[in-house]
């Protein structure tokens, strides 16, 4: 129930990548505004994005306080220009979001190959350890800091001159692979969290090939 000139938000959806987390909803407001609240299962509600005409709210600052907690959000609808107005039950109209556990559900962002270095018949490929907005002791943590050994990278690599791919995996951010001397290789990586059941894999990184700027060659 609610006042006749407000409608409840619907299609509340969490959009989250590497812990950058935004709640989205519908509809686009007509003569109404929204306020969002978020809490953990056992915590108090905290209001965000007060009386906004947006249909999204950045909740990153709240969820990064403890990414292993499960969060619930709700979106309140108020008549524009009369935000004190309540529904017939004496409170504003609102809709609950699905539950969201950042550690288990945030999408893994597209990784980036930071560098590769060839020494003889070995190549060391390094994946950039992306910074997140999760903090510890006033420092922003990297993806590896947050996930530890739960995060692995799969490397795809192939000779520039052929299509046959090989693969390797690492639970650090470095691969050391064997290559044929005198051959150029291309590389792509993918992030995976094996223990997950949803949002397990990232998209593949951009392809990087030897003979381009990121590489280094030593005899």
């Amino acid at each position: 129930s609610g006042t006749t000139n407000t409608v409840a938000a619907y299609n509340l959806t969490w959009k989250s990548t590497n812990f950058k987390t935004i709640l989205e909803w519908e509809p686009k407001p007509v003569n109404q505004v929204y306020t969002v609240q978020i809490s953990t299962k056992s915590g108090d509600w905290k209001s965000k994005c007060f009386y906004t005409t947006d249909t999204e709210c950045d909740l990153t600052d709240e969820i990064v306080k403890d990414v292993k907690q499960t969060y619930l959000a709700r979106v309140f609808s108020y008549p524009a220009g009369n935000v004190e107005s309540t529904g017939s039950a004496g409170e504003p109209l609102y809709e609950n979001s699905p539950e969201f556990t950042p550690y288990l559900e945030t999408n893994l962002g597209q990784p980036t190959i930071q560098s590769f270095e060839q020494v003889g018949t070995k190549v060391n490929v390094t994946v950039e350890d992306e910074r997140t907005l999760v903090r510890r002791n006033n420092t922003f943590l990297s993806l590896r800091d947050v996930f530890g050994k739960d995060l692995i990278y799969t490397l795809y690599y192939w000779k520039s001159s052929s299509s046959g791919k090989k693969t390797a995996k690492t639970n650090t951010n470095e691969f050391l692979i064997d290559v044929d001397k005198g051959e150029n290789y291309c590389f792509s990586v993918q992030a995976v969290i094996p223990s997950r059941t949803v949002n397990r894999k990232s998209t593949d990184s951009p392809v990087e090939c030897m003979g381009q700027e990121k590489g280094e060659f030593r005899e």
Epitope: I152, T154, Y156, K165, K166, T167, A168, K169, I177, Q190, V192, P194, S195, T197, V198, R200, K201, T203, D204
Partner: antibody, heavy 117, light 107 residues
Framework: EVQLVESGGGLVQPGGSLRLSCAAS????????MHWVRQAPGKGLEWVGW????????IYDPKFQDRFTISADTSKNTAYLQMNSLRAEDTAVYYC??????????WGQGTLVTVSS | DIQMTQSPSSLSASVGDRVTITCKAS??????LSWYQQKPGKAPKLLIY???SLADGVPSRFSGSGSGTDFTLTISSLQPEDFATYYC?????????FGQGTKVEIK
């Protein structure tokens, strides 16, 4: 419940072709890597190759690269193994398996391929 | 390619025995090794992953150890249902390779 069901095995003449299917249920194959592993009668397990159904990346044991092709149809939640130029030594039970990227946690029951004239 | 040498190829043991199977990689595979049990006419079943982690639902009498090139599967007290063939698998890099298998038979 997670399930993998292989089909398409049977008797084929040397030089012939066969396409095996691995129908998955209880999960979405694009979230995992899918492998094919074979086992000749009375012998050990032999890895054939894998596919990442989400992007189509395939990896093969080089000995199978020229004759075998792994593919997937995410709309059907099914992985495939296309085998060409079959030889008597390809006679085996062929298994598909789901890979979490840490281990193969579910396997199909296997389908027998017999190559004989 | 990485070769996995598994030993012994077969062994005879009695219920209650402690059984040890080893797998040796031709070069460093860190901890990218898993162990599988296979019974006749059945698909393999995961026992151990990352060399030492026990898979869900697997009895605690099974354990894995090792890293680098040398790995061990131990059954602390063999049970009747443990008579089967055991395989190691390195999945750190392609081509993935299995050991030749160890058949555990009743003495």
């Amino acid at each position: 419940e997670v399930q993998l069901v292989e089909s398409g095995g049977g008797l084929v003449q040397p030089g012939g072709s066969l396409r095996l299917s691995c129908a998955a249920s209880g999960f979405n194959i694009k979230d995992y890597y899918m492998h094919w592993v074979r086992q000749a009668p009375g012998k050990g397990l032999e890895w054939v190759g894998w596919i990442d159904p989400e992007n189509g990346n395939t990896i093969y044991d080089p000995k199978f690269q020229d004759r075998f092709t792994i593919s997937a149809d995410t709309s059907k939640n099914t992985a495939y193994l296309q085998m060409n130029s079959l030889r008597a030594e390809d006679t085996a039970v062929y298994y598909c398996a789901r890979d979490t990227a840490a281990y193969f946690d579910y396997w199909g029951q296997g389908t027998l391929v017999t190559v004989s004239s | 390619d990485i070769q996995m040498t598994q030993s012994p190829s077969s062994l005879s043991a009695s219920v209650g025995d402690r059984v040890t199977i080893t797998c040796k990689a031709s070069r460093d595979i860190k901890s990218y090794l898993s162990w599988y049990q296979q019974k006749p006419g059945k698909a393999p079943k995961l026992l151990i992953y990352y060399a030492t982690s026990l898979a869900d639902g697997v009895p605690s009498r099974f354990s894995g150890s090792g890293s680098g090139t040398d790995f061990t599967l131990t059954i602390s007290s063999l049970q009747p249902e443990d008579f089967a063939t055991y395989y190691c698998l390195q999945d750190g890099e392609s081509p993935f390779t299995f050991g030749q298998g160890t058949k555990v038979e009743i003495k």
